[in-house]
C-alpha cells in the first residue's frame, strides 16, 4: 500500500525519503551537544536545554513548539549537609564513612552542579543498627530470609544489591519487612562484565561509581501531590503525609568499594545458596550484624535530602496532519538526566532530534503526514515519569479520543548486540514489516535485513523464524499512555547479548560516567546503532501517521490473549484442590478469548475488502483499530492501583520494569497458599477472572460489525 495516497504529494516524499534523510553524523553531533553539562530535572540548565530544543524544533519546521510547565515534587541532596553511611564503634565514633561523591571522569573535573549519588525521595533520618544482607531485595529474597531462614529484618538496616528489579520495589519490600533503612549497592557480579576495563578505559563500573535513582512506588500516579490531575497553577496539593508512593525509611546508594567495607565484616547466617553471592571478596553472610571481633560496631545512615515542589518543562512540538489532524501519533522521550546522560536519556533525545529534523525537511518540501504527529521532550522522568504523566493528565480527554499511538524514545542503546522491542501486540506486524525493509548494522550481516539479524540473535521463544518482542512493563514515559489511557504503545532500542552478559542494565547506568565519550569510544563509534534505532522509531511513527489504514493487526492480540490465558490457568492449576473447593473456573475467560479470536479474524477479512476510497468507512475501520487498545481499559483500575487500568498488561507488582499479563488474576493468585482467609482469597481470584473475561469480550465486540 502507498503511504502517500491520501496526502496528494509527490511520490518521493515516502518513507524512503524520510529514512534517507536520517544521518548518523547528526545524531552524534546532537548527542555531544546534549551531554556537556548535567541536565537534572528542576534545574536552570535543564530549562535552558528545553528552550534550546524548542528553538531548534521550530527551525526544523514544526508547525508549533510550546513549553508545558508543571510544579511537581522533586528531591535533592542538601548541598551543605551531605548524605553518607558510617560504621560506628561502641563509643559512637565514625570509623569508616562512605564516599560523598564519585571521582569525576577525565575532562569533567571542573564541571559544577554534578549531583552526588542519592536515592531520590528518601526521607531524612539517621538510623543506626545491625546490617542484614538481603540479596536483591526481591519478594522471593525476603521469603527466603523470613520463612526459610527465620531472619527478622525488623529494626535492622538492610543492604541490597542493585539489579533484577526496580529499586522502588526493593525499598517497598524492605519497608514491609520492618527495616529501618536501606543501603543499595552495585555488585560487580551485576555491573562489571568479565574481560572489560572500568571507565575511562572501558564500559565497566569502577569501584567508586554509584547508581542514582528514585525509590518511589507511584503505581502510575505521576506527581505525588496531585494524583490523577495536572500539577498546574491552581492545583490542590496533598500534604506530604498523604503524598503517593513516598518511602518511609532512609535509603542511600553506594559503589562496590564502599560496599566491600560494609560487607566484609558481616557475620550471622551464611548465604543460603550461591545465588546470594556476588563477586566481591566477602563472605556474603546475611547477618544480622558484624562478625565476632566487630560485633559491637553498627551501621549508621546520615540522610538529609529534601523534597521540594519545583517547576519542570516539557517541550511539545506539533506537525499537523493533512487529512486527519485530530488523530495523534506521539513520539516522546525524556530530556532530564541524573548527570550527563550520555546514554540515559540523551542517546534517545539525539535520535528524536534527528527524527524531527527529517520530518521538518520533508514538511519544508511541501509534504505533510496524514495524521498529526506530536513530538515530546519530557522533563522529570527520572523522578517518577512526572513530565509525561502530568501532560497526559492535563490532556487526557484529547488523548483518549484522538490518540492513535505512542512511541517511546529514551536511551537508544543499552548495548550494541541486537534490537530490542517491547510493544502492544497491535504493533507486531508493523515492527516485523519495517525491520524487513531496514538494513542490519551488525557485523556479519552486511547486506542483510535488520529483521534477519534480530531474529538470529534474539529469536522468539514461541514462533520459529520470528524475533522476540516483549511485553511493555513500566519505568518509562509510555506508562501513562499505555497503562492508564490505553493508547497503543511501543519502544525500541539496541541491547546487549543477554546470554553472555547477565549484569543488570548497563554497568554505568545513572552514574557520573555516563558520558558522551562512553558512547563514542565504547558503544557506538560510528553511531550506526543509533541510526538504526532512529530508523525503527522514526519508521514506526511515519507508518502510524501516514498509512491509509492503521498498521495494527488485531489478530496478533488474539494470539497473545490465548497464550496469557493458558499461562494464568496453569498457575492457578497448581492449586487443583482449592479450585475445586471454591468452584474456580476459567471457562468464561477462554470463551471470551475464543470469541475475540473469531471476531478479530472476521474484522481482518473486512479490513482487506472494504472501500478505502470511502472516507467515512475508512475512518470507521481505523477508529475500531485505534480504540481496540482503549477497550482493554477498566475505568476502575486494578486493585489498589487505580492508575494501572489496562486489564491485559500492567507493571509487575514485584518489579515495575517488567510487564505482567492478566495482572489482576496474577496478583490475586500470588502467594495465595499463605493467605489467612482462603475463601476470601479465592473469591478475589474468581472476581478477577470475571473482570478479565468481561473485558476481553467487551473488547472483541468493539471489532464486530457496527450495525
Amino acid at each position: 500500500k502507498s503511504s502517500n495516497e491520501a496526502t496528494n504529494i509527490t511520490p518521493k516524499h515516502n518513507m524512503k525519503a524520510f529514512l534517507d534523510e536520517l544521518k548518523a553524523e547528526n545524531i552524534k553531533k546532537f548527542l555531544y551537544n546534549f551531554t556537556q553539562i548535567p541536565h537534572l530535572a528542576g534545574t536552570e540548565q535543564n530549562f535552558q536545554l528545553a528552550k534550546q530544543i524548542q528553538s531548534q524544533w521550530k527551525e526544523f519546521g514544526l508547525d508549533s513548539v510550546e513549553l508545558a510547565h508543571y510544579d511537581v515534587l522533586l528531591s535533592y541532596p542538601n548541598k551543605t549537609h551531605p548524605n553518607y553511611i558510617s560504621i560506628i564503634n561502641e563509643d559512637g565514633n565514625e570509623i569508616f564513612n562512605t564516599s560523598l561523591f564519585e571521582p569525576p571522569p577525565p575532562g569533567y573535573e571542573n564541571v559544577s552542579d554534578i549531583v552526588p549519588p542519592f536515592s531520590a525521595f528518601s526521607p531524612q533520618g539517621m538510623p543506626e543498627g545491625d546490617l542484614v544482607y538481603v540479596n536483591y531485595a526481591r519478594t522471593e529474597d525476603f521469603f527466603k530470609l523470613e520463612r526459610d531462614m527465620k531472619i527478622n529484618c525488623s529494626g535492622k538496616i538492610v543492604i541490597a544489591r542493585y539489579g533484577k528489579v526496580f529499586r522502588g520495589n526493593k525499598v517497598k519490600n524492605a519497608q514491609l519487612a520492618g527495616a529501618k533503612g536501606v543501603i543499595l549497592y552495585s555488585d560487580p557480579a551485576d555491573y562489571f562484565a568479565p574481560g572489560v576495563k572500568s571507565y575511562p578505559d572501558g564500559w565497566n563500573l569502577p569501584g567508586g561509581g554509584v547508581q542514582r535513582g528514585n525509590i518511589l512506588n507511584l503505581n502510575g500516579a505521576g506527581d505525588p501531590l496531585t494524583p490523577g490531575y495536572p500539577a498546574n497553577e491552581y492545583a490542590y496539593r496533598r500534604g506530604i503525609a498523604e503524598a503517593v508512593g513516598l518511602p518511609s525509611i532512609p535509603v542511600h546508594p553506594i559503589g562496590y568499594y564502599d560496599a566491600q567495607k560494609l560487607l566484609e565484616k558481616m557475620g550471622g547466617s551464611a548465604p543460603p545458596d550461591s545465588s546470594w553471592r556476588g563477586s566481591l571478596k566477602v563472605p556474603y553472610n546475611v547477618g544480622p550484624g558484624f562478625t565476632g571481633n566487630f560485633s559491637t560496631q553498627k551501621v549508621k545512615m546520615h540522610i538529609h535530602s529534601t523534597n521540594e515542589v519545583t517547576r519542570i518543562y516539557n517541550v511539545i512540538g506539533t506537525l499537523r496532519g493533512a487529512v486527519e489532524p485530530d488523530r495523534y501519533v506521539i513520539l516522546g522521550g525524556h530530556r532530564d538526566s541524573w548527570v550527563f546522560g550520555g546514554i540515559d536519556p540523551q542517546s534517545g533525545a539525539a535520535v528524536v532530534h534527528e527524527i524531527v529534523r527529517s520530518f521538518g525537511t520533508l514538511k519544508k518540501e511541501g509534504w505533510r503526514p496524514r495524521r498529526t504527529i506530536l513530538f515530546a521532550s519530557w522533563d522529570a522522568e527520572e523522578f517518577g515519569l512526572l513530565g509525561s504523566t502530568e501532560w497526559a493528565e492535563e490532556n487526557s480527554r484529547l488523548l483518549q479520543e484522538r490518540g492513535v499511538a505512542y512511541i517511546n524514545a529514551d536511551s537508544s542503546i543499552e548495548g550494541n548486540y541486537t534490537l530490542r522491542v517491547d510493544c502492544t501486540p497491535l504493533m507486531y506486524s508493523l515492527v516485523h514489516n519495517l525491520t524487513k525493509e531496514l538494513k542490519s548494522p551488525d557485523e556479519g550481516f552486511e547486506g542483510k535485513s535488520l529483521y534477519e539479524s534480530w531474529t538470529k540473535k534474539s529469536p522468539s521463544p514461541e514462533f520459529s523464524g520470528m524475533p522476540r518482542i516483549s511485553k511493555l512493563g513500566s519505568g518509562n514515559d509510555f506508562e501513562v499512555f499505555f497503562q492508564r489511557l490505553g493508547i497503543a504503545s511501543g519502544r525500541a532500542r539496541y541491547t546487549k547479548n543477554w546470554e553472555t552478559n547477565k549484569f543488570s542494565g548497563y554497568p554505568l547506568y545513572h552514574s557520573v560516567y555516563e558520558t558522551y565519550e562512553l558512547v563514542e569510544k565504547f558503544y557506538d563509534p560510528m553511531f550506526k546503532y543509533h541510526l538504526t534505532v532512529a530508523q525503527v522509531r522514526g519508521g514506526m511513527v511515519f507508518e502510524l501517521a501516514n498509512s491509509i489504514v492503521l498498521p495494527f493487526d488485531c489478530r496478533d492480540y488474539a494470539v497473545v490473549l490465548r497464550k496469557y490465558a493458558d499461562k494464568i490457568y496453569s498457575i492457578s492449576m497448581k492449586h487443583p484442590q482449592e479450585m475445586k473447593t471454591y468452584s474456580v473456573s476459567f471457562d468464561s475467560l477462554f470463551s471470551a478469548v475464543k470469541n475475540f479470536t473469531e471476531i478479530a479474524s472476521k474484522f481482518s477479512e473486512r479490513l482487506q475488502d472494504f472501500d478505502k476510497s470511502n472516507p467515512i468507512v475508512l475512518r470507521m475501520m481505523n477508529d475500531q483499530l485505534m480504540f481496540l487498545e482503549r477497550a482493554f481499559i477498566d475505568p476502575l483500575g486494578l486493585p489498589d492501583r487505580p492508575f494501572y487500568r489496562h486489564v491485559i498488561y500492567a507493571p509487575s507488582s514485584h518489579n515495575k520494569y517488567a510487564g505482567e499479563s492478566f495482572p489482576g488474576i496474577y496478583d490475586a493468585l500470588f502467594d495465595i497458599e499463605s493467605k489467612v482467609d482462603p475463601s476470601k482469597a479465592w473469591g478475589e481470584v474468581k472476581r478477577q477472572i470475571y473482570v478479565a473475561a468481561f473485558t476481553v469480550q467487551a473488547a472483541a465486540e468493539t471489532l464486530s460489525e457496527v450495525a
Partner: nanobody
C-alpha cells in the same frame, strides 16, 4: 607534566606546629586518594596519613594520631598536613604521594611522589 610539589617544611621547636602543603599539577587531585609519607634520617619510609579523594575518610599512623590532620582542597588541587605538638622523632623528609587507584577507600600503592620537604624538630 604530572608532578607534586611539597612546601612548608622547616626547623621548629618541640611542641610547636607546622603546616605542610602539596600542590598537584598535571592531573586532577579530586579523583585520587592522597598520602603523606616520611623518611627519618638513615631510616626507611614510614606512611603517615591518607585521605580519600572526597575527604570522607582519613587514616593515620598510630605515632601521629591525634596530633596530625590531613586535609585537602580539591578546588585548589592542594593537599595539606597540619602537624601539632611536634616531637623530635617527627624529624624527617615528608613526601606527598598519589594513590594509584581512582576512588580508593583505603591506602593503596603510590604512583606519583613529590621531591619532599624537610621538617626538623629540635630545641
Amino acid at each position: 607534566e604530572v608532578q607534586l610539589l611539597e612546601s612548608g617544611g622547616g626547623v621548629v621547636q618541640p611542641g610547636r606546629s607546622l603546616r605542610l602543603s602539596c600542590a598537584a599539577s598535571g592531573f586532577p587531585l579530586i579523583s585520587y586518594g592522597m598520602n603523606w609519607v616520611r623518611q627519618a634520617p638513615g631510616k626507611g619510609l614510614d606512611w603517615v596519613a591518607f585521605i580519600t579523594y572526597d575527604g570522607s575518610n582519613r587514616y593515620y599512623a598510630d605515632s601521629v594520631k591525634g596530633r596530625f590532620t590531613i586535609s585537602r582542597d580539591n578546588s585548589k588541587n592542594t593537599l595539606y598536613l597540619q602537624m601539632n605538638s611536634l616531637k623530635p622523632e617527627d624529624t624527617a623528609v615528608y613526601y606527598c604521594a598519589k594513590d594509584r587507584i581512582v576512588g580508593a577507600r583505603v591506602p593503596d600503592a603510590y604512583d606519583i611522589w613529590g621531591q619532599g620537604t624537610m621538617v626538623t624538630v629540635s630545641s
